[in-house]
């Protein structure tokens, strides 16, 4: 059974992945120039159900593309050096969803936009930390 | 819990830069993300942007874009905040807060010719 | 962005009195809804969070509840040191918003 100093530290973990993934999509809604447009032509697997923190494996399998449409984004406007961003975000969902059971992600029919991803992360992450506290 | 101690007032002119800190001090730096929030005399409060002080990657208000610069140095547990191309209305008080729930004293700067 | 509105701007009340601040934000916020008191001068001291949650060392006269779009804060008791400025801040997505602020002052 979870402890509370583990509950703890997986509540610190999740509220991090939720503020690295919520900097994003303020980086991007900021932006007002063709790279949004062209960043919106990528396509992201959405998972078909995200529950539990094991479908974080999901999100795992989809860093690199995000890493890669990011990078499309630097500029001087642009601050959150994906590099250093994602590798903060991988290290935590590493963690959050554990090295012992190996789960293979089931994706959805329908591809989505980087902002529509980024909300369902978002909104997956809240929702496990309200079950938290 | 962590403490954020901020550097002192400063008076400005027009055009100029101001760099503000928020020293943190009583736990691990890097557990907080440090959220900049303004102030303005008489007004209410404005989010300015967010830094993750372990990887020193920010984001900021839409407002700010281009004008504001959060930094870090994990040495010292700092975190910067620096503010361009200044104008009267950026007189404000400035606060630093970590996690939203943990906030520095404020620093007041003024902007006049 | 989502935009924070607050009911009443001001009001006046009495030690003692029953108070009751409304939030409303402009699209669904969930419960990641905060509330600040401050004081003159002072930063602002969080007393609720995730809309109902008493933040560690605030008197338990004062509790928050709602969510999704509207919430409020209510102090059932009102104490001389509460006599201040209350704010409302979403933080379910950036940028960080917050109400303009409600003034409760003495009548």
């Known amino acids: 059974a979870p402890t509370s100093s583990s509950t703890k530290k997986t509540q610190l973990q999740l509220e991090h992945l939720l503020l690295d993934l919520q900097m994003i999509l303020n980086g991007i809604n900021n932006y007002k120039n063709p790279k949004l447009t062209r960043m919106l032509t990528f396509k992201f697997y959405m998972p078909k159900k995200a529950t539990e923190l094991k479908h974080l494996q999901c999100l795992e399998e989809e860093l690199k593309p995000l890493e890669e449409v990011l990078n499309l984004a630097q500029s001087k406007n642009f601050h959150l050096r994906p590099r250093d961003l994602i590798s903060n975000i991988n290290v935590i969902v590493l963690e959050l969803k554990g090295s012992e059971t190996t789960f293979m992600c089931e994706y959805a029919d329908e591809t989505a936009t980087i902002v529509e991803f980024l909300n369902r992360w978002i909104t997956f992450c809240q929702s496990i930390i309200s079950t938290l506290t | 819990q962590v403490q954020l101690v901020q550097s002192g007032a400063e008076v400005k002119k027009p055009g100029a830069s101001v760099k503000v800190s928020c020293k943190a001090s009583g736990d691990e730096f890097t557990r907080y993300y440090v959220h900049w929030v303004r102030q303005a005399p008489g007004q209410g409060l404005e989010w300015m942007g967010i830094i993750n002080p372990s990887g020193g990657y920010a984001s900021y208000a839409q407002k700010f874009q281009g004008r504001v610069t959060m930094t870090r140095d994990t040495s010292t547990s700092t975190v910067y905040m620096e503010l361009s191309s200044l104008r009267s209305e950026d007189t404000a008080v400035y606060y630093c807060?970590?996690?939203?729930?943990?906030w520095g004293q404020g620093t007041l700067v003024t902007v006049s010719s | 962005d989502i935009q924070m509105t607050q009911s009443p701007s001001s009001l006046s009340a009495s030690v003692g009195d029953r108070v009751t601040i409304t939030c409303r934000a402009s699209?669904?916020?969930?419960?990641?809804l905060a509330w600040y008191q401050q004081k003159p001068g002072k930063a602002p001291k969080l007393l609720i969070y995730?809309?109902?949650n008493l933040e560690t060392g605030v008197p338990s006269r004062f509790s928050g509840s709602g969510s999704g779009t509207d919430f409020t804060l209510t102090i059932s008791s009102l104490q001389p040191e509460d006599f201040a400025t209350y704010y409302c801040q979403q933080y379910n997505r950036f940028p960080v918003t917050f109400g303009p602020g409600t003034k409760v002052d003495i009548k």
């Open positions: 807060a970590a996690g939203l729930f943990i």
């Open positions: 995730s809309a109902s």
């Open positions: 699209q669904s916020i969930g419960r990641w």
